[in-house]
């Protein structure tokens, strides 16, 4: 039961995370005009990965797409790529994990197959989360660099008669959404990997062959060097799972502390 819960929770957490990554990627507020220590401008600028917007004090908002591909900074292209890779991997991971869910029966799918699929989706979620966190962090670093450069410009070269309003950009809402979403996807992926351990047999399972000895039965397991010796009247052939010593309910899930960036 604990494995199913861990797997289900991992799926839900990853689903929320990937939805967040998609939302962050589509959001326009990756960088927003820094209002601190600035004159009260009647326009508010903010930018996303795909377009830049201006919200006028009058309430009207105008957005313009980045219609050029070659003219865009390489860093922005890299961030776009990271976010898209994150979304694609996450989407594939979700698709795989749906079929891997223990609560969903698909034909006569073996537990080992489900375990492999759970692990695959878990790894995909982890990579997806890392891509999102990396993308957002690269963009944030770009903002910090530009912020301090424009701050330096504000206090130098003001010798001329005409002053210009230096528009500085700071972290937008999309960055925080991206960081949290990436973190959730990562956590979901880790949970899927943990669930996989509970689903998977530790060794390849074969039908055990029972040899009847007088007084006790010894079941030999070909391929393994373990034998289960049972005293009692049960002399029927039985499937022996190495992981059978643990029931689903007995699988322990250890609470872990996750720090959000």
């Amino acid at each position: 039961m604990a494995v199913t819960a861990c797997q289900g929770l991992g799926f839900v957490v990853s689903l929320i995370g990937i939805a967040g990554i998609i939302a962050a990627t589509c959001m326009d507020q990756w960088s927003t005009q820094d209002l601190y220590n600035n004159p009260v401008t009647a326009v508010f600028n903010y930018q996303g990965l795909w377009r830049s917007c201006v919200r006028e004090s009058s309430g009207f908002t105008e957005c313009r797409g980045y219609f050029t591909l070659l003219g865009l900074p390489a860093m922005l292209q890299a961030v776009r790529a990271l976010m898209i890779v994150g979304i694609v991997l996450g989407a594939i991971g979700l698709l795989v994990s749906i079929f891997a869910l223990k609560c969903i029966r698909i034909g006569s799918m073996e537990d080992s197959a489900k375990a492999n699929m759970t692990l695959t989706s878990g790894i995909m979620f982890i990579v997806s989360g890392l891509c999102a966190i990396a993308g957002v962090s690269v963009f944030a670093n770009m903002l910090v660099t530009n912020f301090w450069m424009s701050t330096a410009n504000m206090y130098t070269g003001m010798g001329g008669m005409v002053q210009t309003v230096q528009t500085r950009y700071t972290f937008g809402a999309a960055l925080f959404v991206g960081w949290v979403a990436g973190g959730l996807t990562l956590i979901g992926g880790v949970m899927m990997c943990i669930a996989c351990r509970g689903l998977a047999p530790e060794e390849t399972n074969y039908k055990a062959v029972s040899y009847h000895a007088s007084g006790h039965s010894v079941a030999y397991k070909p391929g393994g060097f373990k034998a289960s010796t049972g005293f009692g009247s049960n002399t029927k052939n039985k499937k022996i799972y190495d992981g059978g010593a643990r029931t689903e309910d007995e699988v322990q899930s250890y609470p872990s502390k996750h720090d959000y960036v």
Partner: antibody
């Protein structure tokens, strides 16, 4: 058709108070930011105050800060300017104007004259 | 505060003539976000409230005759009337719409000979 009608002007003694109103019609008042602009006799235009569609933010010109209060009643489609501690230099024609694209003022009222004199 | 300087303070022209008036701001009114300058031109005929002519320095308001043209960017702006008509007799104001307080220029009075 967009219409803005100011009222409440008149003769006021220095140090006195006055409340101006601007009745709006012909547009969704609650969706637009509004301004008060004044014009002293034979002088140029001077921006006085701004209130956004949702009543926040609000901005004032330095000369009226702390003395004038701009407010609005969206259900009643009315803009207000409460003026206190009036001075002779506040004598002017007061116009209300609607905020538009480019932060421009596309529709203006006919104005209401406020005269501050002893 | 941004200071708006208009010149000349008055212009005397004959009907049909082309006329230009200038407006300079003490700070740039150009917004990099949308590549637009936040300067507006108004016309105020005697005894009337101001009327919007041009916003974003060069965008003509609907219903405004095409003889009115706005140009310029940053700090230097110009309003041009290609062929002055009798009804153009008015005071023309430029306004900073970029930084509060939204200051106006002192105006350019257009008079007919």
């Amino acid at each position: 058709d967009v219409q803005l009608v100011e009222s409440g002007g008149g003769l006021v003694q220095p140090g006195g108070s006055r409340k101006l109103s601007c009745a709006a019609s012909g547009f969704t008042f609650s969706s637009f930011g509004m301004h008060w602009v004044r014009q002293a006799p034979e002088k140029g235009l001077e921006w006085v105050a701004y209130i956004s569609s949702g009543s926040s933010p609000i901005y004032y010109t330095d000369t009226v800060k702390g003395r004038f209060t701009i407010s609005r009643d969206n259900p009643k489609n009315t803009l207000f300017l409460q003026m206190t501690s009036l001075r002779s230099e506040d004598t002017a024609m007061y116009f209300c104007a609607r905020f538009y694209y480019g932060n421009s003022f596309d529709h203006w009222g006919q104005g209401t004259l406020v005269t501050v004199s002893a | 505060d941004i200071v708006m300087t208009q010149s000349p303070s008055s212009l005397t022209v004959t009907a049909g003539e082309k006329v230009s008036m200038s407006c300079k701001s003490s700070q740039s009114l150009f917004n990099r976000g949308n590549q637009k300058s936040y300067l507006t031109w108004y016309q105020q005929r005697p005894g009337q409230p101001p009327k919007l002519l041009i916003y974003w320095a060069s965008t003509r308001e609907s219903g405004v005759p095409d003889r009115f043209t706005g140009s310029g960017s940053g700090t230097d702006f110009t309003l041009t009337i290609s062929s002055v008509q009798a009804e153009d007799l008015a005071v023309y104001y430029c306004q900073n719409n970029y930084i509060y307080p939204l200051t106006f220029g002192a105006g350019t009075k257009l008079e007919l000979k």
